[in-house]
């Protein structure tokens, strides 16, 4: 597993460095999670041919994965810091059930899958501290999540492989869009 944020060689080599700001900590946390996703994607792509699947085939999958849209205030046109922050936190909370699904999907990267899940929880906490309008953040319903998880786990092998690939790809894209927006704040 990658070294957790704040423990990399750069920090060790620069003891005079100021403590990380809230923005720097969030930035590092996202980059750390992206590292983990990269490792998980490697295993997924080595195991199946899902990574070569066409976008059309992937689009047929009816997963309701969070995605950034212009209305969310995270794009440069119509950028709105608070609206965007709410979208990022809400999206990450919605991804949690899918990250739970990933937990039993990896053999050699089991630890990595757990690290991605736990690091995402920490990221949500960091972001919630940054947000002013916590009331606007809707938390997914646990009952709905539980039935979704059961449904996903009941799929056949091919669909489970496809779901795993789609979750990783979409989560990576969502984090990249979030990283870009957060750096503009």
């Amino acid at each position: 597993a990658p070294v957790p944020p704040g423990e990399d060689s750069k920090d060790v080599a620069a003891p005079h460095r100021q403590p990380l700001t809230s923005s720097e900590r969030i930035d590092k946390q996202i980059r750390y999670i992206l590292d983990g996703i990269s490792a998980l994607r490697k295993e997924t792509c080595n195991k199946s041919n899902m990574c070569e699947s066409s976008k059309e085939a992937l689009a047929e999958n009816n997963l309701n994965l969070p995605k950034m849209a212009e209305k969310d205030g995270c794009f440069q046109s119509g950028f709105n810091e608070e609206t965007c922050l709410v979208k990022i936190i809400t999206g990450l909370l919605e991804f949690e059930v899918y990250l739970e699904y990933l937990q039993n999907r990896f053999e050699s990267s089991e630890e990595q899958a757990r690290a991605v899940q736990m690091s995402t929880k920490v990221l949500i906490q960091f972001l919630q501290k940054k947000a002013k309008n916590l009331d606007a953040i809707t938390t997914p319903d646990p009952t709905t999540n539980a039935s979704l998880l059961t449904k996903l786990q009941a799929q056949n092998q091919w669909l489970q492989d496809m779901t795993t690939h789609l979750i990783l790809r979409s989560f990576k894209e969502f984090l990249q869009s979030s990283l870009r927006a957060l750096r503009q704040m």
């Epitope: 992206l34 794009f75 990576k172």
Partner: antibody, heavy 122, light 107 residues
């Protein structure tokens, strides 16, 4: 192999609109983390960033030129188009398109086109 | 906007020498800084991304370091092909900004 190539007029008259096309191969502008930007360089001067478009169609412009610039992409044709209105002799420069593509969005231009020299003169 | 300032604006050195050039950002950009090399009549070429990571294919005699507002590019054992202009780039947030460049002459 990743390649980019700029095309467009070499000479434009003041007040006219410049349209430049960046045709690329070896990557897809629908892959997350991928973007294409435009950078210009007046003769003997430094590089100046103009515009950038991401895989998800998020667009960024240089604040000083924003009112004159439009960037668009055609993913199926592997092309990015930059238009710049109301051209002036001070806009004479070599115009480059360049790719940025990495998981962590380091905004680093790892591959550049050869550049096209645009002269603004009546 | 984040301003990028490079120093010196020009320098000359002999083949085999080592040189260091610097780049300052007007505010903290963490490690979001890139270095490019441009030979006359050619397009720029990425040397270093994220302050200290060498781009694939770039010789190990190049070394980038720094964080927050102060960054350096060091070239050890200069070669004739190292001549040209070096630009640093703010890669933290848009608008992206470049430094004015450091012109390196190899004697």
């Amino acid at each position: 192999q990743v390649t980019l190539k700029e095309s467009g007029p070499t000479l434009v008259k003041p007040t006219q609109t410049l349209t430049l096309t960046c045709s690329f191969s070896g990557f897809s502008l629908s892959t997350s983390g991928v973007g294409v930007g435009w950078v210009r360089q007046p003769p003997g001067k430094a590089l100046e960033w103009l515009a950038f478009i991401w895989w998800d169609d998020d667009k960024y412009y240089s604040p000083s030129l924003e009112s004159r610039l439009t960037i668009t992409k055609d993913t199926s044709k592997n092309q990015v188009v930059l238009t710049m209105t109301n051209m002036d002799p001070v806009d004479t420069a070599t115009y480059y398109c360049a790719r940025s593509a990495d998981d962590y969005l380091y905004y680093s231009f790892d591959t550049w086109g050869q550049g096209t020299l645009v002269t603004v003169s009546s | 906007d984040i301003q990028m300032t490079q120093s010196p604006s020009s320098l000359s050195a002999f083949v085999g020498d080592g040189v260091t050039m610097t780049c300052w950002a007007s505010q903290s950009i963490n490690d979001y800084l890139n270095w490019y090399h441009q030979r006359p009549g050619e397009a720029p070429e990425l040397l270093v991304f994220a302050a200290s990571n060498l781009q694939i294919g770039v010789p190990s005699r190049f070394r980038g370091s720094g964080s927050e507002t102060y960054f350096t590019l060091t070239i050890n054992s200069l070669q004739p092909e190292d001549s040209g202009t070096y630009f640093c780039q703010n890669a933290h947030s848009f608008p992206l900004t470049f430094g004015g460049g450091t012109k390196l002459e190899i004697k």
